[in-house]
Interface confidence: medium
C-alpha cells in the first residue's frame, strides 16, 4: 500500500513534470517565436487513455520527437537546452510510471499538434495531482 511519504514524493514529481511541461508550452506559445508555424505542423501521437501513472509510457515514447521539435524553437525561450530538458522529464517519467511492469501504450487514431499534446499531458498531471491531495 502506498505510504504518505511515497504519495508525497509522487505528488512532488508530478508537480515538477507539470511545471516542465508548462514551461515548454509557454516557450512555444511565445508570440515572438518565429518557428511556431513550422512546429505546429509536426504531429504527435496521443494516448487512447491516460488516467493512471502507467500511462506515462505514452509520454515517454513521444519524448524524442518532442526534443526534435524543441530544437526548432529559439533557445532563448527555454532556460535549458532541449536535450537537458527532455532528459529531466524522462527521469521523472521513468520514476513515476515505474519499471516493474511493462505497459504497451495504445494511441488514439487522431494526431495532435505540440500545443494539443502538451495540454493533454498537463491536464493528466493536474488530474493525478488532484487525486493525491
Amino acid at each position: 500500500a502506498p505510504t504518505s511519504s511515497s504519495t508525497k514524493k509522487t505528488q512532488l514529481q508530478l508537480e515538477h513534470l507539470l511545471l516542465d511541461l508548462q514551461m515548454i508550452l509557454n516557450g512555444i506559445n511565445n508570440y515572438k517565436n518565429p518557428k511556431l508555424t513550422r512546429m505546429l505542423t509536426f504531429k504527435f501521437y496521443m494516448p487512447k487513455k491516460a488516467t493512471e501513472l502507467k500511462h506515462l509510457q505514452c509520454l515517454e515514447e513521444e519524448l524524442k520527437p518532442l526534443e526534435e521539435v524543441l530544437n526548432l524553437a529559439q533557445s532563448k525561450n527555454f532556460h535549458l537546452r532541449p536535450r537537458d530538458l527532455i532528459s529531466n522529464i524522462n527521469v521523472i517519467v521513468l520514476e513515476l510510471k515505474g519499471s516493474e511492469t511493462t505497459f504497451m501504450c495504445e494511441y488514439a487514431d487522431e494526431t495532435a499538434t505540440i500545443v494539443e499534446f502538451l495540454n493533454r499531458w498537463i491536464t493528466f498531471c493536474q488530474s493525478i495531482i488532484s487525486t493525491l491531495t
Partner: antibody, heavy 124, light 107 residues
C-alpha cells in the same frame, strides 16, 4: 529505399473527372506530409497543397482550393489528387513529393523525395 | 501569398565557372528557403534546405546562403551534369511558393 510511385499518364476530355495516385514505400507513410506540385508545359513549379496521411489534415494553396481535392488512404500508403470536372488548362505534369523531417516524422521542410510525375492531358 | 523572384532567368557559363543565382522573397522568410534542381524531362531534386543546409548526397560544389528576403545559390565549379533549371521555394508560410526558375546551361 524510400520512393513515391505515381499512376500513369492520362488523356481526358474537358468536363471529365480524374483521380491520380501516389504510392509511398520504404518509410512510415502516415508520418510524413505529402505535397502536390503542378508544372504546366514549359513552365515553373506551382505548389498545390499538402496532406498528412496520418489524420488526413489537408492544406491547399488558395489558387487550387475548390479546383482539386487532395486525399489519402493510409491503409494502402497512397495519396490522391482529383478533379471533378477537368478543363483544358489542367493540362500539366503533376508531381507528388514528401516533406522531410526528423525522428521519422515530418513538418514543413523541403520536399526530399519526389514521384516520377503524372502527365495529364485534357483535350477535346 | 509570398512572392518569390529569381535572377537571372537564364545563364550560360563555362565548365569550371562559379555560378550564382539570386532568389528574393516579398517578405521576411527567416531562413526557410529550399533549392531544387530539375533536369529536362525529370522530377525536381532536393538540393538545399533552410537556406544553407546541403541535403545528404548532394555534391559540395553546391551551396546556399542568405536570410530574411535575399538568398543566394552557388555552383562553385560548374560541371556538364549541372545543366538544369534551379528553383527556390519558401516554406515559411502557406501556401509554399516557388521562384520562376533559373535555367543554367554550358557555353
Amino acid at each position: 529505399e524510400v520512393q513515391l510511385v505515381q499512376s500513369g499518364a492520362e488523356v481526358k476530355k474537358p468536363g471529365e473527372s480524374l483521380k491520380i495516385s501516389c504510392k509511398g514505400s520504404g518509410y512510415r507513410f502516415t508520418n510524413y506530409w505529402i505535397g502536390w506540385v503542378r508544372q504546366m508545359p514549359g513552365k515553373g513549379l506551382e505548389w498545390m497543397g499538402i496532406i498528412y496521411p496520418g489524420d488526413s489534415d489537408t492544406k491547399y494553396s488558395p489558387s487550387f482550393q475548390g479546383q482539386v481535392t487532395i486525399s489519402a488512404d493510409k491503409s494502402i500508403s497512397t495519396a490522391y489528387l482529383q478533379w471533378s470536372s477537368l478543363k483544358a488548362s489542367d493540362t500539366a505534369m503533376y508531381y507528388c513529393a514528401r516533406h522531410g523531417g526528423y525522428s521519422g516524422r515530418s513538418y514543413y521542410y523541403g520536399m526530399d523525395v519526389w514521384g516520377q510525375g503524372t502527365a495529364v492531358t485534357v483535350s477535346s | 501569398d509570398i512572392q518569390m523572384t529569381q535572377s537571372p532567368s537564364s545563364l550560360s557559363a563555362s565548365v569550371g565557372d562559379r555560378v550564382t543565382i539570386t532568389c528574393q522573397a516579398s517578405q521576411d522568410i527567416s531562413n526557410y528557403l529550399n533549392w531544387y534542381q530539375q533536369k529536362p524531362g525529370k522530377a525536381p531534386k532536393f538540393l538545399i534546405y533552410d537556406a544553407s543546409n546541403l541535403e545528404t548526397g548532394v555534391p559540395s560544389r553546391f551551396s546556399g546562403s542568405g536570410s530574411g528576403t535575399d538568398f543566394f545559390f552557388t555552383i562553385s565549379n560548374l560541371q556538364p551534369e549541372d545543366i538544369a533549371t534551379y528553383f527556390c521555394q519558401q516554406d515559411d508560410n502557406l501556401p509554399f511558393t516557388f521562384g520562376p526558375g533559373t535555367k543554367v546551361d554550358i557555353k
